[in-house]
Interface confidence: low
Amino acid sequence: LQPGAEVPVVWAQEGAPAQLPCSPTIPLQDLSLLRRAGVTWQHQPDSGPPAAAPGHPLAPGPHPAAPSSWGPRPRRYTVLSVGPGGLRSGRLPLQPRVQLDERGRQRGDFSLWLRPARRADAGEYRAAVHLRDRALSCRLRLRLGQASMTASPPGSLRASDWVILNCSFSRPDRPASVHWFRNRGQGRVPVRESPHHHLAESFLFLPQVSPMDSGPWGCILTYRDGFNVSIMYNLTVLG
C-alpha cells in the first residue's frame, strides 16, 4: 500500500465470523517459499466511546476500565504471529477465535479469521508476510455492524393482522440488494412479491397474515463491496 493511500475497509457482523483478507502478490520465484513463510498480524483498536473498545480486545484477561471521555488511541499490539514452521505466538493464552487457515497459507492466503467478531475488534489491522529475503504487507480497517430484524407491531399476531418486517444493518451506506426468504424443510424459499407480500427496500409488508405465515423469515442484505449479511426472524401467527 502506497503511503497516503486509503486503507481498504472490511465490514463484518458482530457475533459472526469475519475474514480479514490478505493475499499479497507473491513473485513467481518466491512461490516455493510459501511453505516456510511467516506472518504477523497486528491490531490498532479504534479509539471510541467508552463502551466501544477498552483495552486490548483480542487479548485475554480483564480489560481496564474505560476513560470517561474519548481517550488516546489504544496501543497497537500483535494479535497473532505464525513462524515459518507454523509455530504460533501472540498474547498468551492464544484465543481460539483468532485463526489462520493453514492450507490457505500454503497457497498464499494469509487471511485472519475472527470466529466470531466482537465489537472491540474494530480498528486497523496490518499483516506482515515474511519470505526468505523480503516482507510483504496487508493493511485494512475492520468495521463492525449490528444486524437486526424488527417486526411492527412486535409479538404474536392473529390471523388477518398486518405486520411490517424491517431488515437492517448498522452501516451508513444503503444495501445494493435485499432478498427475502422463508426457511423451510430442505432450504430457503424466496419470497416473491404478491398481494400478500409487499417488498420495499429493506421492508416487507404483510397486509393480512395467516397461520401459514408462522415460522422463520429471513433477509439477505448485500452491499456494493460484496459484504452480505443474513438475518432471521421468527413470526408467530395464532390461528
Partner: antibody, heavy 122, light 111 residues
C-alpha cells in the same frame, strides 16, 4: 368485473420484434401480478414470466429470459410483453393472466386475457 | 425444472359418469403446509379457466362437480358427474418453484 383485454393478432418477419399489450380493468392493477403464458397450436401451456406492476419486479422462466421483456405502465393499467429476434418457434398464442391472492403464496392465475396470436413468417 | 406428467392424455367418459385425471410431479410441490398445484380447464379457442387452487380448493363460481385431491407429488382432478359442458382440455400447474410449469394436458371427451 375483472377484465384483461389483449391487443390484436400480429404478423411479423423472422428477426423482428413485437410488443403485445394487456389492459387491465375492474381491479387495482398495482395490487396483483400479471403473468404471460405461451401456447403453440395444438400444444400445452408454457409460463413465460410475471411482472408486479407496483414495483416493476419481474420473474422470468430462464428459457424466455433472452426472448421476452415484461414491462407495465401503471398510469394506463397496461402490461406489455416484447418478444425479440422472432423465429417460427415463436409463432403461438400468448395469454396474459392475473395472479390471484390465495394466502399470498405462489398463487394461481384467476383471470385470463383472450390471447394474442403471433405468426412469424417470411 | 419440476416436470408434471398428466395421465391419461385423453379420456372418453359417458354423461353422468365420473372422470378422473392424474397429475404426477417429478418432485414435491408442497410447502408451508399446502400443495402449490392448481387445475385449469381450457375449451377450444378459449383462454384457460381456473378450477381448483392449491390442490383441493374450489375456485369461486366453479360447480361442486369438480374436486381436487392429493399432496406432495400425486394429485387428482375428479369430475362427477360429467356433463356435456365439461368437454375440454385440463391442465395441472405447479407454482412451488420457478419456472412455474404445466402438465401436458388431458383431453376429456364424451362417449
Amino acid at each position: 368485473q375483472v377484465q384483461l383485454q389483449q391487443s390484436g393478432a400480429e404478423l411479423a418477419r423472422p428477426g423482428a420484434s413485437v410488443k403485445l399489450s394487456c389492459k387491465a380493468s375492474g381491479y387495482s392493477f398495482t395490487s396483483y401480478g400479471i403473468n404471460w403464458v405461451k401456447q403453440r397450436t395444438g400444444q400445452g401451456l408454457e409460463w413465460i414470466g410475471e411482472i408486479y406492476p407496483r414495483s416493476g419486479n419481474t420473474y422470468y422462466n430462464e428459457k424466455f429470459k433472452d426472448k421476452a421483456t415484461l414491462t407495465a405502465d401503471k398510469s394506463s393499467s397496461t402490461a406489455y410483453m416484447e418478444l425479440r429476434s422472432l423465429t417460427s418457434e415463436d409463432s403461438a398464442v400468448y395469454f396474459c393472466a392475473r395472479g390471484g391472492t390465495y394466502d399470498g403464496y405462489y398463487y394461481a392465475m384467476d383471470f385470463w386475457g383472450q390471447g394474442t396470436s403471433v405468426t412469424v413468417s417470411s | 425444472d419440476i416436470v408434471l406428467t398428466q395421465s391419461p392424455a385423453s379420456l372418453a367418459v359417458s354423461l353422468g359418469q365420473r372422470a378422473t385425471i392424474s397429475c404426477r410431479a417429478s418432485e414435491s410441490v408442497d410447502n408451508f403446509g399446502s400443495s402449490f398445484l392448481h387445475w385449469y380447464q381450457q375449451k377450444p379457442g378459449q383462454a384457460p379457466k381456473l378450477l381448483i387452487y392449491r390442490a383441493s380448493n374450489l375456485e369461486s363460481g366453479i360447480p361442486a362437480r369438480f374436486s381436487g385431491s392429493g399432496s406432495r407429488t400425486d394429485f387428482t382432478l375428479t369430475i362427477n358427474p360429467v356433463e356435456t359442458d365439461d368437454v375440454a382440455t385440463y391442465y395441472c400447474q405447479q407454482v412451488n418453484k420457478d419456472p412455474r410449469t404445466f402438465g401436458g394436458g388431458t383431453k376429456l371427451e364424451i362417449k
